[in-house]
């Protein structure tokens, strides 16, 4: 674990990164089951 | 604690160099590690920064022109092809902490570029 | 990346006056400043992070107030080694504004 100023928000952002990534995913997965099913 | 630059010396324009950035008594795997130069009688110029896992970002004005890249006790800033603005003492740093209220430096180390 | 302005460049001032240096960001950096102090020959030290919050071991002297694109750092009771230059530094999504230092104000303190 770190406590540097620097390395705090990088850990934030990075981890907003991920999460976005994930919903991104998702978010596709489902797009392209619908266009699938259609 | 300690933080100390290494690698400076005269080298003619063109010719590749390393510095190297040695720590010891804390890790670099939980702290971001910055590189800072100062041209003889100048202010103070930020290169770049290495975080905890690896990954780097650069001024603008140094993108191409420097790498940073770390094992686990030695950080590095390789100057590509050296000009003689890029005389200067060359700076590493341990970023500042929130609870332990400081950051760490060392001395520096000068590169001269002359032909 | 963002720019960061710093003034004047140079100040005198009397042992016991009280000096004001003044850093201004090209955009808002909220409160993701440092101040440092230099003297010939060594390393930066830092006094003060998050705009204001005094590093371990650095004088109550010493005061850094500001946000957004306004800082300053106010240096009160002045002493003969508080004689340095001084350099503020941004350090606010670093990976995408970078961290460039102020121009430096070198402090003559008379």
């Known amino acids: 674990h770190s406590d540097g100023i620097f390395t705090d928000s990088y850990s934030r952002y990075r981890k907003q990164m991920a999460v976005k990534k994930y919903l991104a995913a998702v978010l596709g997965k489902r797009y392209k089951q619908r266009v699938k099913n259609k | 604690q300690s933080v100390e630059e290494s690698g400076g010396r005269l080298v003619t324009p063109g010719t590749p160099l390393t510095l190297t950035c040695t720590v010891s008594?804390?890790?670099?795997?939980?702290?971001?590690m910055i590189w800072v130069r100062q041209a003889p009688g100048k202010g103070l110029e930020w290169i770049g920064i290495?975080?905890?896992?690896?990954d780097t970002y650069y001024a603008s004005w140094a993108k191409g022109r420097f790498t940073i890249s770390k094992t686990s006790t030695t950080v590095y800033l390789k100057i590509a092809s050296p000009t003689t603005e890029d005389t200067a003492t060359y700076f590493c740093?341990?970023?500042?902490?929130?609870?332990?209220?400081?950051?760490?430096w060392g001395q520096g180390t000068l590169v001269t570029v002359s032909s | 990346d963002v720019v960061m302005t710093q003034t004047p460049a140079s100040v005198s001032e009397p042992v016991g006056g009280t000096v004001t240096i003044k850093c201004q960001a090209s955009?808002?950096?909220?409160?993701?400043l440092l101040w440092y102090q230099q003297k010939p020959g060594q390393p930066p030290k830092l006094l003060i992070y998050?705009?204001?919050t005094l590093a371990s071991g650095v004088s109550s002297r010493f005061k850094g107030s500001g946000s957004g694109t306004e800082f300053t750092l106010t240096i009160s009771d002045l002493e003969c080694a508080d004689a340095a230059t001084y350099y503020c530094?941004?350090?606010?999504?670093?990976?995408?504004?970078?961290?460039?230092f102020g121009g430096g104000t070198e402090v003559v303190v008379k």
């Open positions: 998050r705009a204001s």
């Open positions: 740093a341990r970023e500042p902490g929130s609870t332990t209220q400081n950051d760490l």
């Open positions: 290495i975080y905890d896992n690896g």
């Open positions: 955009e808002n950096i909220y409160n993701s």
């Open positions: 008594g804390f890790s670099l795997s939980s702290y971001a």
């Open positions: 530094q941004n350090y606010y999504n670093i990976w995408t504004n970078g961290a460039a």
